[in-house]
């Protein structure tokens, strides 16, 4: 039975040309996290394997940085980066948990950032 829940940064906005940290946190389960994948719509951005580390897709290596923690940092943002992002937690024995974040990249220099998310 899957008892876990994923907390995310939710809906966030950032300024064009800037950076943003995408973060998720899995709680309420004792399942072992074996891998976390970060996806944008249908594209895989990065993999963080618990034992074998971070791997960034070659298509995104210039603009995506691992961390902090299991999070992902997007750099040099463009308006085309607006959209849904997913953190996919592969766990044992529970299976897969998915969290959703919506990022809006604004042209304005007064982009309003979502509340700062803290990992407990």
């Amino acid at each position: 039975m899957m008892t876990g829940t994923i907390e995310t940064t939710g809906n966030i906005s950032a300024e064009k040309g800037g950076s943003i940290i995408l973060q998720c946190h899995l709680s309420s389960t004792t399942a072992q996290v074996t891998q976390v994948n970060w996806e944008q719509q249908d594209q895989l951005l990065a993999i963080c394997n618990a034992d074998l580390g971070w791997h960034i897709s070659p298509s995104f290596k210039d603009r995506v940085a691992p961390g902090p923690g299991l999070g992902l940092t997007l750099q040099s943002l463009t308006v085309n980066d607006t959209g849904e992002y997913f953190c996919i937690y592969h766990t044992y024995p529970d299976g897969t948990y998915t969290g959703r974040i919506f990022l809006e990249v604004l042209e304005s220099s007064v982009a309003e950032h979502g509340a700062r998310f803290q990992i407990p």
């Epitope: 074996t34 891998q35 994948n37 996806e39 249908d42 594209q43 895989l44 993999i47 394997n49 618990a50 034992d51 074998l52 580390g53 791997h55 897709s57 070659p58 592969h90 044992y92 897969t96």
Partner: antibody
Framework: QVQLVESGGGVVQPGRSLRLDCKAS????????MSWVRQAPGKGLELVAT????????YYPDSVKGRFTISRDNSKNTLFLQMNSLRAEDTAVYYC????????????WGQGTLVTVSS | EIVMTQSPATLSLSPGERATLSCKAS??????VSWYQQKPGQAPRLLIY???TRATGIPARFSGSGSGTDYTLTISSLEPEDFAVYYC?????????FGQGTKVEIK
């Protein structure tokens, strides 16, 4: 250059135990996660254990979970695979392997060591 | 776990011919696929990772492509040393699983 050298294979009876070693050189062993991959005679490849760089995290597929234990001694640049309650279906060549730097794939492999489980 | 199915099991070709090897995943693996070559008595050798990136030292005649559940390894013109068994592997979810292999043999 990266070198991985396995040892410890041999013939063992079902139900018994065996420990495999993999001696690493040519890279900073303590900075890399490591894996064991096996290949039954004439068959395909199966990842059987992984361990992170400091030994604090491990992973096993269901086929070996509870019977195999991966560990490492970073001071000796050595990876281990302790195999208990061995079965005939564990007969295989066992390779230790490392991902390439920034490479999502096993770029470095040892020569393999054959484990035969037979009565 | 994700099952990787390779086809054909055996491919009989002559040197100089083009080889097309297929790997189908049981679910979308979003380009987290690598390919290996293995010759008898040897360890596997990494050829391709992230579906289409050639590993260090791999000749340009080897190329990978694909997305979703379908991936292809192409050898544009077979050299004598290319006759071997080829495996695909997915890294999208744990456990990272391999296909059963395609043997490329001399016709």
């Amino acid at each position: 250059q990266v070198q991985l050298v396995e040892s410890g294979g041999g013939v063992v009876q079902p139900g018994r135990s065996l420990r495999l070693d993999c001696k690493a050189s040519g890279f900073t062993f303590s900075s890399y996660g490591m894996s064991w991959v096996r290949q039954a005679p004439g068959k395909g490849l199966e990842l059987v254990a992984t361990i992170n760089s400091n030994g604090g995290s491990t992973y096993y597929p269901d086929s070996v979970k509870g019977r195999f234990t991966i560990s490492r001694d970073n001071s000796k640049n050595t990876l281990f695979l302790q195999m208990n309650s061995l079965r005939a279906e564990d007969t295989a060549v066992y390779y230790c392997a490392r991902l390439g730097t920034g490479t999502l794939g096993f770029a470095y492999w040892g020569q393999g060591t054959l484990v035969t489980v037979s009565s | 776990e994700i099952v990787m199915t390779q086809s054909p099991a055996t491919l009989s070709l002559s040197p100089g011919e083009r080889a097309t090897l297929s790997c189908k995943a049981s679910q979308d693996v979003k380009t987290a696929v690598s390919w290996y070559q293995q010759k008898p008595g040897q360890a596997p050798r990494l050829l391709i990772y992230w579906a289409s990136t050639r590993a260090t030292g791999i000749p340009a005649r080897f190329s990978g492509s694909g997305s979703g559940t379908d991936y292809t390894l192409t050898i544009s013109s077979l050299e004598p040393e290319d006759f071997a068994v080829y495996y695909c592997q997915q890294h999208y979810s744990t456990p990272w699983t391999f296909g059963q292999g395609t043997k490329v043999e001399i016709k």
